[in-house]
Amino acid sequence: KAMHVAQPAVVLANSRGTASFVCEYASPGKATEVRVTVLRQADSQVTEVCAATYMMGNELTFLDDSICTGTSSGNQVNLTIQGLRAMDTGLYICKVELMYPPPYYMGIGNGTQIYVIDPEPCPDSDF
């Protein structure tokens, strides 16, 4: 059962390789348990970046070694991806699943193009 998911078209990572964006979904029902997955699409390959299942009103809990962190507020999820490098530039897709109570709903956003520019190395300074 399809659900509308919105996310920004483009985001630029900061100099520390961190990018943040909001994933918003139009919930058809009153979900209490939600699963959010970030997928990366590059060269027609789709890979899972991170995933978290959370109870409405609670914090998102990603795995300890995850490069993602996030917070939720109503039907919005604020996602942050850390440790990005230029080679990680690509389309990051937000997938939202309403897990409980039934019925199950799933929606996939159009993706956020994240651009990552590796910082220039600092030139040696002469004293």
Epitope: K1, K30, P101, P102, P103
Partner: antibody, heavy 114, light 112 residues
Framework: EVQLLESGGGLVQPGGSLRLSCAAS????????MSWVRQAPGKGLEWVSG????????GYADSVKGRFTISRDNSKNTLYLQMNSLRAEDTAVYYC???????WGQGTLVTVSS | QSVLTQPPSASGTPGQRVTISCTGS?????????VHWYQQLPGTAPKLLIY???NRPSGVPDRFSGSKSGTSASLAISGLRSEDEADYYC???????????FGGGTKLTVLG
């Protein structure tokens, strides 16, 4: 194609026990809430019990609370219903359903009689 | 006594439009949860007819439609046909019961 195949029904005496199983295929079983719905002869549909994808949330109809236990094994794509202290009024066809009764099995008949 | 109230029976002649109501409460339909409708032909397992208040699964004719307002919902069948003779049930999630509730069912008879 989604398939739900119930088994384990049969004739049992009042006070006896049965364990129903539902083998699921054709969809990502571990994503979905699953439930058991029953229909007594000539009667309407009655939700019996349900379980969330992770087994964290379980619910039971008042008529079976304390006697029936629902469980699932996501690695085996199987749903279970352990029925204890069976009564004559538990006689029904028991259906396994996925999500909010999106798909239904063909049902298994449970008859409680002496 | 079902948590959702449906008329026990309904009837119509071929070609007619028939409506079946389903009345709930603030803990189910009124809480914003989606209503679903099922058709059970004699001697068979129930089949999903309408999901999410007004959506038809593929294969269900557009003669069947659903709607929801407040604490009630309804199923409409237009252009009634003899093969529509069946039992019809509504269902919805209920917060207070932490489970699914069904209506008592409506037996639809196609006359003539």
């Amino acid at each position: 194609e989604v398939q739900l195949l119930e088994s384990g029904g049969g004739l049992v005496q009042p006070g006896g026990s049965l364990r129903l199983s539902c083998a699921a295929s054709g969809f990502t079983f571990s994503d979905y809430y699953m439930s058991w719905v029953r229909q007594a002869p000539g009667k309407g549909l009655e939700w019996v019990s349900g379980i969330s994808w992770s087994s964290r949330d379980k619910g039971y109809a008042d008529s079976v609370k304390g006697r029936f236990t629902i469980s699932r094994d996501n690695s085996k794509n199987t749903l279970y219903l352990q029925m204890n202290s069976l009564r004559a009024e538990d006689t029904a066809v028991y259906y396994c359903t996925t999500d909010l009764a999106r798909y239904w099995g063909q049902g298994t008949l449970v008859t409680v009689s002496s | 006594q079902s948590v959702l109230t449906q008329p026990p029976s309904a009837s119509g002649t071929p070609g007619q439009r028939v409506t079946i109501s389903c009345t709930g409460s603030s803990s189910n339909i009124g809480a914003g949860y989606d209503v679903h409708w099922y058709q059970q032909l004699p001697g068979t397992a129930p089949k999903l007819l309408i999901y999410g208040n007004d959506n038809r699964p593929s294969g269900v004719p557009d003669r069947f439609s659903g709607s929801k307002s407040g604490t009630s919902a309804s199923l409409a069948i237009s252009g009634l046909r003899s093969e529509d003779e069946a039992d019809y049930y509504c269902a919805v999630w209920d917060d207070s019961l932490n489970g699914v509730v069904f209506g008592g069912g409506t037996k639809l008879t196609v006359l003539g």
